[in-house]
Interface confidence: low
């Protein structure tokens, strides 16, 4: 199989761009940063550095639609009913894909066409107030190279590893888009 | 109280099709995936097939791959199995089960149907 | 994908423990925590026991344990109860999207 020097994408047959990325969120005036993490119990929530748990790959499923997973919960980011999200193993068209925008700002919006809702960190009580409101805190993300080592995959879902600081390297994450930095890596994720 | 009934079992020679049928109730059923069980006669547990909640994404064994077809049917609260180019090794009860949500993990099972596949 | 290998019969006398393995590979039980057991009456339809290696669903008795060590998954039963005489089997999620079952434990209770 080759791969493409594009940029940091894994392919597989279908030729179809795999991003591995931190996705970075903050609160309101900078203050509780954090990185979306998908937990092997299927809880999603913040690491406040970046973690093995927080390295994701973005996959477009469809014109500026994307599926998110966790590389080492393997699980997919989903959204339920409510706006809450959920780390899945099974992945689904309704639940798990996320119309992508890309904001002037360099951050990133993920809207469950669905739900019509942006995937959010925020808490039950906050995606209430939103619905009153107009924007929901968490759920601007800005996406970051990793930089951190990947754990041997037989402590797959075992550990909350240390915190790791790191610059903040982004790119846009447009999916048909030519993006550098970060050599192709093989996953067995998004195998089909 | 979740029931999952399953309807459409019976013998069939080897090469040819049957549709098994699973009529659910008592859960909102297009917010669950589902799958499709087997067990042949005195042997193990093998899963067949999944489909999500809304019917977009499937999944299947490799055994069963390009034979098989699950599909759903959220406004009859019904699930299927279209079975094609039928082998004696798929002689097996299928069980419908229902997924806890989307995890491959099954919270309730029916009972069962009987396919023989015979000649 | 092969099947999971489990014992196929495993014996204990009531109020003892006994442990059923179940041993798959690095795609499998050894790569993700997505273990599960069933337990099966005859005639009857299988019941979830143990999911995600070692968590127990409400209403499951907690003489029901679970582990996980490399590429063997156990499930361990303790005080056996006459009750508990049934087939078990394990399932993990797969590299492939897809669950494989092991060939089944017959539990006799002596």
């Known amino acids: 199989l080759a791969f493409s020097d594009a940029g940091p994408h894994v392919h597989y047959g279908w030729g179809d761009p795999i991003r591995l990325r931190h996705l970075y969120t903050s609160g309101p005036h900078g203050l509780s940063s954090c990185f979306l993490r998908i937990r092997a119990d299927g809880v999603v929530d913040c690491a406040r550095g970046q973690s093995a748990h927080s390295l994701l790959e973005i996959k477009a499923v469809a014109l500026r639609t994307v599926a998110i997973k966790g590389v080492h919960s393997v699980r997919y980011l989903c959204m339920g009913a409510d706006g809450k999200m959920q780390g899945l193993l099974q992945y689904s068209e309704e639940d798990c894909a996320f119309e992508e925008e890309i904001r002037p700002d360099g951050y990133n919006v993920y809207r469950s066409e669905k739900h019509r809702l942006p995937v959010s960190l925020s808490s039950a009580k906050q995606r209430q107030l939103y619905k009153n409101r107009g924007f929901l805190p968490l759920s601007h993300f800005l996406p970051m190279l990793p930089m951190v080592p990947e754990e041997p995959e037989d402590l797959r879902g075992h550990l909350e590893s240390d915190m790791f600081s790191s610059p903040l390297e982004t790119d846009s994450m447009d999916p048909f888009g030519l993006v550098t930095g970060l050599e192709a890596v093989r996953s067995p994720s998004f195998e089909k | 109280e979740v029931q999952l009934l399953e309807t459409g079992g019976g013998l069939v020679q080897p090469g040819g099709s049957l549709r098994l049928s699973c009529a659910a109730s008592?859960?909102?059923?297009?917010?669950?995936?589902m799958s499709w069980v087997r067990q042949a006669p005195g042997k193990g547990l093998e899963w067949v097939s999944a489909?999500?909640?809304?019917?977009?994404?499937?999944y299947y064994a490799d055994s069963v791959k390009g034979r098989f077809t699950i599909s759903r049917d959220n406004s009859k609260n019904t699930l299927y199995l279209q079975m094609n180019s039928l082998r004696a090794e798929d002689t097996a009860v299928y069980y419908c089960?229902?997924?806890?949500?989307?995890?491959?993990?099954?919270?309730?099972w029916g009972q069962g149907t009987l396919v023989t596949v015979s000649s | 994908q092969a099947g999971l290998t489990q014992p196929a019969s495993v014996s204990g006398s009531p109020g003892q423990s006994i442990t059923i393995s179940c041993t798959g590979t690095?795609?499998?039980?050894?790569?993700?925590?997505?273990v599960s057991w069933y337990q099966q009456h005859p005639g009857k339809a299988p019941k979830l026991m143990i999911y995600?290696?070692?968590n127990r669903p409400s209403g499951v008795s907690d003489r029901f344990s679970g582990s996980k060590s490399g590429n063997t998954a156990s499930l361990t039963i303790s005080g056996l109860q006459t009750e508990d005489e049934a087939d078990y089997y394990c399932?993990?999620?797969?590299?492939?999207?897809?669950?494989?079952f092991g060939g089944g434990t017959q539990l006799t209770v002596l």
């Open positions: 399932s993990s999620y797969t590299r492939s999207s897809t669950l494989v």
């Open positions: 489909i999500s909640g809304s019917g977009g994404s499937t």
């Open positions: 089960a229902k997924d806890v949500w989307q995890e491959l993990l099954f919270d309730y």
């Open positions: 690095s795609s499998d039980v050894g790569g993700y925590n997505y």
């Open positions: 008592g859960f909102t059923f297009s917010s669950y995936a």
């Open positions: 995600d290696v070692s």
